[in-house]
């Protein structure tokens, strides 16, 4: 649902995009995720700010928690406990990392509507949630877990041994949060609440990151982060169960490791709840092309945990690493012992598969050459996924259903025709037993949100369609988009190309490629986006594009397993290839040809200016990783094995920026980076500037003082403007 | 101060049922902070812990005596009692009662009872 | 089950010496470990909790040590009340467990 393209004699009511549009989001979109509590339930915020209960089946709604209550405490969000008796009250929201953060909690007695005194929570929380049934609080303050039976009780302490920076229980420390569990929360609650699983990572010696934060004081202070480096020493795991019906006499039990996992450096990589009685664990060796998945049963005389060998499930990968970017978690069907899980097929092709006693027996569900992206929901009789298999653009997302009730299963796409021009990239929020689903969609079109019966699939209604913005974009000139792939050498090269809204094929355009191109990464998808790169395209004239090469995602393990162990060759061979077929197109003035990256992209468009083809007149690198020694140990591993001698060090020492510097000399390169990046490390800009400057190579540069990985606040206004005034220099466009 | 007397007989036929109970003086039962256990010793030989039980009624047992054994509270005579089935020689012993404190964990058997002597014999 | 090993099994010693007892768990339980000291024909006596904390009452003179697999009980200076058998126990896990036990003799 893009705006109608226009004619000539309507063009002077129409403008281009500016950049002030995009940093202030004129051109934002919402989503709407309803917050399930049942099967027929859900909860919102409305937009004045009161918490409504929604049923689908008697169409009623009615508040539950009013925007004065919200406001008393400041909230900024919210949590009812499954008995619907309290409401959890966020405030103080303090960001830590990319997914932890502390607050302030409230207990809100929806019964008496007062707010629940005595054996008050303590100040700042780091984790909190209710149980799956009833009323139990879990929380975790200063890295130890306290659980209380009902929110007026007194706690009871689980773990003693939390330290900061040293010892997190129920909390991961900062790489298991970024690189492999992507959560704020390391412990988890069993399926009626008899259980509570949580992970313990010693950090001890794990060598720190220190960093200056400059603040406003006197002096600046030091950022500590237990960080692990490339090769460095690692988090050490364990997972504990507590029985929180009766916590104290027996205690936390720890989950035992499996034999061939222990031998050597390992991880714990994700936790899953079977029944309440049944546990299943994930790990991985650290060289990560070997997860095992374990199943543990609770053996009641002895209140400990049994994970018999039998109920070990290997996989391995022969040709990279295991999984795509994170290793797949398994959806138990209701037997409680069968699961459903993604992994690559014969063919090299991430598939779902139907484990029932042996990986080796695996029954494949779905198969072709194309990906199952991710499991939804496994009901009695349904099993629905998300797929990129429609019409074979890797970029779009379908939802399908298989009927696992009946044989041979039967397979719909449940979103291939829904509003096939407007949707194409879909994901999908399910209710209890899937009796109902919202689907949102996310482009090529303006987004829009569905509600839908989980039998029938019909669409009950909308729930968010973007009116508003489908009016503010009327009279925009928004930029052309196109997906198309490039067949280059067997490989095939998607790429998106964003246009300028009177693009002629007949001009020269300057093109600037947006790179990001980390291994398991997509760039090329149909979403609808309104941003700086539609803003260059639509009043800058530029002509953008992005390219999926080698170690993308969702085309198989050929192209993602291709850059295993050889990272910053292939990706930036790929870019130039693709700008070299640009070229060929026409359309391109190769004298104006730039890249900018962020993050991996950083690193990519750094290599890429730095090649010495001559293809690029400048290029920007924000935040960029400069050598993989200096990035952490989890992901670098991953892709990268060890940087030792009899590993893989060679390969380290050769892919750095560094080691190019005097290739530099003939662009206009602008290095970005923030001073308190705690992800990639302004180390690595602080190594690219040194070897530029004892190579005596003339660059740009720009830092962001007490600025993270995101530069976001006021720093993202300056760093696009920033990045425009030199494109626009680089491209000698007038200002 | 707390005390704690074992009573029940001391000698017990093959095959039946050993039946003791725990009467607690100088303090409740009915504290969320300890359990009540059973904990016996064989002439000349070391301690072997039974079981233990919450005033809520909650139980723990040890594995190797679990199919034999119940222990039981009640909480308005302040007591806990041990039933053990199918006796053998192998059952004689002095049983012990003792509190046993959990919170703070970890859990240790502060207040003993003096013990009273069962002989498993026709 | 969590076996738990004393040794030695007995010892003889002299008034004021210094007596050293170790025990050691087939697996880790923290520092959930306490010891007992019984005397012929008498219940066992709570000295030590958690490896290393003392029960109110006991005479300084008992220190205990260790955590994971191996602890230690010391007794720094004997005196003739010390004489008889002592038993570590561990809280970490079902059945609680008791070792074997060390009987301090005097010489």
């Known amino acids: 649902l893009r705006p109608p393209r226009v004619h000539n004699s309507e063009e002077n009511t129409m403008r281009a995009l500016t950049l002030k549009d995009i940093l202030n989001g004129t051109f934002s979109y919402k989503t709407f995720f309803p917050n399930w509590i049942s099967g027929q339930e859900y909860l919102h915020q409305s937009a004045d700010n009161n918490i409504v209960l929604y049923n689908i089946e008697t169409g009623q709604s009615y508040t539950i928690l009013s925007n004065r209550t919200m406001k008393s405490v400041n909230a900024s969000n919210y949590g009812l406990s499954p008995d619907r008796q309290f409401v959890y009250l966020e405030s103080d929201y303090s960001k830590l990392w990319r997914y932890s953060y502390t607050a302030t909690y409230y207990i809100y007695d929806l019964s008496n509507g007062e707010f629940v005194r005595g054996n008050e929570l303590p100040r700042p929380i780091q984790y909190l949630c209710w149980s799956p049934v009833g009323s139990k609080l879990a929380y975790v303050y200063q890295n130890n877990i306290y659980l209380k039976q009902r929110p007026g009780d007194p706690p009871f302490q689980i773990t003693f041994n939390g330290r900061e920076n040293k010892i997190f229980n129920g909390i991961p420390d900062w790489v298991y949060e970024e690189e492999m569990l992507a959560t704020k929360y390391a412990l988890w609650w069993s399926p009626n609440g008899k259980f509570l699983a949580y992970a313990e990572f010693n950090d001890t010696d794990i060598p720190v990151i220190a960093y200056s934060y400059y603040g406003d004081e006197q002096y600046p202070r030091t950022i500590n982060i237990p960080y692990p480096k490339a090769g460095a020493k690692n988090p050490f795991v364990r997972i504990f169960i507590i029985d929180t019906t009766y916590p104290a006499y027996v205690g936390p039990q720890e989950v035992p490791v499996p034999a061939m996992i222990a031998s050597s450096d390992y991880y714990f990589s994700w936790l899953t709840w079977v029944t309440d009685e049944r546990v299943c664990l994930q790990w991985l060796k650290r060289v990560q092309n070997v997860s095992v998945l374990s199943i543990c049963d609770f053996r009641e005389d002895w209140q400990t945990w049994d994970c018999p060998k039998t109920q070990e499930h290997i996989e391995e990968s022969r040709t990279g690493w295991a999984g795509g970017f994170f290793v797949s978690t398994p959806v138990f069907s209701y037997d409680a012992i069968s699961y459903y899980k993604i992994f690559s097929d014969k063919d090299g092709y991430k598939h779902i598969h139907y484990i029932k006693d042996t990986v080796e027996n695996a029954i494949q569900i779905t198969s072709g050459k194309w990906e199952a992206i991710n499991i939804f929901r496994v009901t009695q009789d349904s099993l629905f996924y998300s797929s990129n298999e429609f019409e074979d653009y890797p970029g779009r997302r379908n939802i399908y259903r298989i009927s696992i009730g009946s044989y041979p299963p039967s397979k719909k796409c449940v979103t291939c025709h829904l509003r096939k021009e407007r949707c194409q990239y879909y994901t999908a929020s399910f209710s209890d037993y899937a009796k109902y689903y919202a689907l949102v969609c996310y482009g090529p079109g303006i987004p829009i949100s569905t509600l839908h019966d989980g039998r029938t699939d019909q669409e009950i209604k909308i729930l968010e369609e973007n009116k508003e913005l489908e009016n503010a974009l009327k009279n925009i000139q928004l930029p052309k988009e196109e997906i198309k792939k490039l067949e280059v050498d067997e490989i095939t090269l998607w790429y998106k190309m964003i246009l300028p809204p009177q693009f002629d094929r007949s001009k020269k355009y300057p093109l600037l490629i947006q790179v990001y191109g980390g291994p398991c990464s997509q760039s090329v998808r149909s979403v609808f986006a309104v941003n700086w790169i539609s803003y260059l395209a639509s009043k800058e004239g530029m002509v953008i594009a992005l390219v999926d090469g080698r170690g993308t995602a969702f085309q198989g393990d050929k192209l993602l397993y291709a850059v295993y162990r050889k990272l910053g060759v292939y990706e930036v061979e790929d870019q130039i290839t693709a700008v070299r077929k640009f070229i060929e197109m026409g359309f391109i003035d190769e004298k104006r040809i730039a890249i900018w990256g962020w993050s991996y992209g950083g690193y990519v468009s750094s290599l890429a200016l730095a090649s010495g083809t001559g293809l690029f007149k400048c290029g920007i690198a924000v935040a960029p990783v400069s050598s993989w020694e200096y990035y952490a140990s989890v992901y670098t591993e991953r892709f990268m094995g060890l940087p030792t001698k009899d590993d893989n060090l060679e390969h380290y020492k050769n892919s750095t920026v560094m080691a190019r510097a005097e290739y530099f000399r003939n662009v206009d390169y602008l290095l970005i980076h923030g001073t308190a990046d705690d992800n990639v490390h302004f180390q690595n800009s602080a190594q690219i500037a040194k070897a530029l400057v004892n190579a005596q190579v003339d660059f740009q540069a720009m830092w962001y003082s007490d600025q993270n990985h995101g530069l976001s606040g006021l720093s993202t206004n300056h760093l696009y403007t920033h990045m425009t005034h030199f494109l626009k220099q680089c491209f000698s466009l007038s200002d | 101060q707390l005390q704690l007397q074992e009573s029940g007989p001391g000698l017990v036929k093959p095959s039946e049922t050993l039946s003791l109970t725990c009467t607690v003086s100088?303090?409740?039962?009915?504290?969320?902070?300890?359990?009540w256990g059973w904990i016996r010793q064989p002439p000349g030989k070391g301690l072997e812990w039974i079981g233990s039980?919450?005033?809520?009624?909650?139980?723990y047992y040890n594995p190797s005596l679990k199919s034999r054994v119940t222990i039981s509270v009640d909480t308005s005579k302040n007591q806990f009692s041990l039933r053990l089935n199918s006796v053998t020689a192998a059952d004689t012993a002095v049983y012990y009662c003792a509190r046993e404190i959990i919170e703070p964990r970890p859990g240790y058997f502060d207040y003993w009872g003096q013990g009273t002597l069962v002989t498993v014999s026709s | 089950d969590i076996q738990m090993t004393q040794s030695p099994s007995s010892l003889s010693a002299s008034v004021g010496d210094r007596v050293t007892i170790t025990c050691r768990a087939s697996?880790?339980?923290?520092?959930?470990l306490n010891w007992y000291q019984q005397k012929p024909g008498k219940a066992p006596k709570f000295l030590i909790y958690a490896a290393s904390s003392l029960q109110s009452g006991v005479p300084s003179r008992f220190s205990g040590s260790g955590s994971g697999t191996d602890f230690t009980l010391t007794i720094s200076s004997l005196q003739p009340e010390d004489f008889a058998t002592y038993y570590c126990?561990?809280?970490?896990?079902?059945?609680?467990?008791f070792g074997q036990g060390t009987k301090v003799e005097i010489k």
């Open positions: 039980i919450f005033y809520s009624g909650n139980t």
């Open positions: 126990q561990q809280s970490n896990s079902i059945p609680r467990t």
């Open positions: 697996q880790s339980i923290s520092k959930y």
């Open positions: 100088g303090g409740s039962i009915s504290s969320s902070t300890y359990y």
